[in-house]
Interface confidence: low
């Protein structure tokens, strides 16, 4: 077995008792912040599981990969990573599991090379609309972000602001059209009940979209038409009942798409006929032979691909005089 990721003998490690001095002077080339491990050869700094309450001020200018996972950061203020000279090479920033509940406007400003950002497993009760765009202009400077990982960022019910969590996240994704170059977006495990209809149209470069393990019931108002580069769409472990003709046609029209639909409670009644027909013909659904009915009870566990039109009936609607309670 190899050794664990969290301790690195090949990294130079700052002594825990050294205070990280805030200074206008640029850090020394080989300086490593207290409670961090640094490797100039790998251009990597790891400050992992150290209960840090703020981003170290004395990050080395060479850092390309920065791991700040498993800390207690709470808030990322504007310019949290702004340094003089700037962290011009920082390309991958992982802040997962650091108890962030607030990310303010401009938190990631002055990171000209930032390609990958992971904020997963933080209870983000307050994500500024301008967290990623940096400004409130209607059209912001393009963000360099290519991959944005926002899995399990939903806060506990009692910590949510009195507003739609979906709406808060989407506002940050769309502000200033800054994320036009985004290629990978992961939004798994966020209890999303719906996907605001305008979000995908404004992220035209997406290659990979992960919406798995949410609570999406329907895609009726979601358009995939503009996502001509989309390669994978993950919709596993949601609450989808059926995909309607418009959605099916849009998915079929995407040239590189692979769709993942496992573990949804498909309702196998007359409304499912179009989807069953499409599943039998399409090559875009991965593992389509595993899709099974959840409802009605008589259809439970039936394989969708094995159904025919005679199986897919809707109970007749009784006139009011014949209805029973």
């Amino acid at each position: 077995s190899s050794s664990p990721t969290s301790s690195a003998s090949s990294f130079s490690s700052s002594a825990p008792f050294l205070a990280s001095a805030v200074s206008a002077q640029p850090p020394l080339p080989d300086q490593c912040p207290a409670l961090c491990e640094c490797s100039e050869a790998a251009r990597t700094v790891k400050c992992v599981n150290r209960n840090l309450t703020e981003v170290p001020t004395d990050l080395p200018a060479y850092v390309r990969n920065l791991f700040l996972t498993g800390n207690q950061l709470a808030v990322l203020p504007a310019g949290a990573f702004a340094r003089r000279p700037p962290l011009a090479e920082l390309a991958a920033l992982n802040l997962s599991g650091s108890r962030l509940d607030e990310v303010r406007a401009g938190a990631f400003e002055h990171l000209p090379s930032l390609r990958q950002l992971d904020l997963s497993h933080n209870p983000l009760a307050d994500l500024s609309p301008f967290a990623f765009s940096g400004s409130n202009a209607s059209v912001s400077a393009p963000s360099p972000l290519v991959e944005l990982i926002l899995n399990h960022i939903v806060p506990p019910e009692d910590e949510r602001q009195n507003r739609s969590f979906e709406g808060m996240v989407v506002a940050a994704l769309l502000a200033g059209r800054a994320l036009q170059g985004l290629r990978r977006l992961e939004l798994a495990s966020n209890h999303f009940l719906y996907l605001p209809r305008d979000v995908l149209a404004q992220l035209p470069s997406l290659r990979h979209l992960d919406l798995s393990n949410n609570s999406l019931v329907s895609l009726t108002y979601v358009s995939f038409r503009n996502l001509t580069h989309l390669e994978s769409l993950h919709l596993e472990d949601n609450a989808l009942k059926v995909l309607h003709n418009g959605t099916l046609a849009e998915l079929q029209g995407l040239p590189h798409i692979r769709v993942f639909l496992d573990n949804n409670p498909w309702v196998c009644d007359c409304h499912m006929a179009d989807m069953v027909t499409w599943l039998k013909e399409t090559e875009v659904v991965q593992g389509k032979d595993r899709l099974t009915c959840a409802y009605p009870e008589k259809m439970r566990n039936r394989v969708l691909l094995e159904l025919n039109s005679a199986d897919l009936d809707c109970d007749p609607i009784l006139p009011p005089s014949l209805q029973t309670s």
Epitope: S2, T44, Q116, E186, D210, R258
Partner: antibody
Amino acid sequence: EVQLLESGGGLVQPGGSLRLSCAASGFTFSSYAMSWVRRAPGKGLEWVSAISGSGGSTYYADSVKGRFTISRDNSKNTLYLQMNSLRAEDTAVYYCARYYGGYYSAWMDYWGQGTLVTVSS
Amino acid sequence: DIQMTQSPSSLSASVGDRVTITCRASQSISSYLNWYQEKPGKAPKLLIYAASSLQSGVPSRFSGSGSGTDFTLTISSLQPEDFATYYCQQTYGYLHTFGQGTKLEIK
């Protein structure tokens, strides 16, 4: 200490079936995606299959799709690979490995020692 | 699926040499590229993850670079224990393919 221990390998005839197991310990099993990788005699490593931490998502190499099934029992901290319709070209040492990070931004940081599967008449 | 092509397939070198192995992806994979070392009868071992990050416990003579489609594993000064087979692996696509391997032998 993280440990992965494969079992279930052996000699089987073409067309036969075998189930491999991988017992995991030393970490929170359900939090990690897991994978099976194999190395055939004289060949390189081949990624075979992977499964998400919850077991809700599974992935297969084209060479095994429809014949192999990956699964996991998180209550038993065990990963499985059910291999059906085995062929001579499935002969290999099979390793189970743990993914560190999400499936799409991951690397295999711990590996078992492997179990040998031989398909021959 | 994303194809990974390593070069060279085999390589002879001496202790103390600087060695470079390259890996090319059939499409851009950002920095989702890992390097593993395998020795006969042993389990593979992670060396480099995310293209350039050194795994814990791996000697600093190993380094990785590259992004997009072209990646490099460099061993700055070969040691006797480094003679092994090296593999790259992409985790950008939903199927995580390996390169065919580069066997590093003693000259």
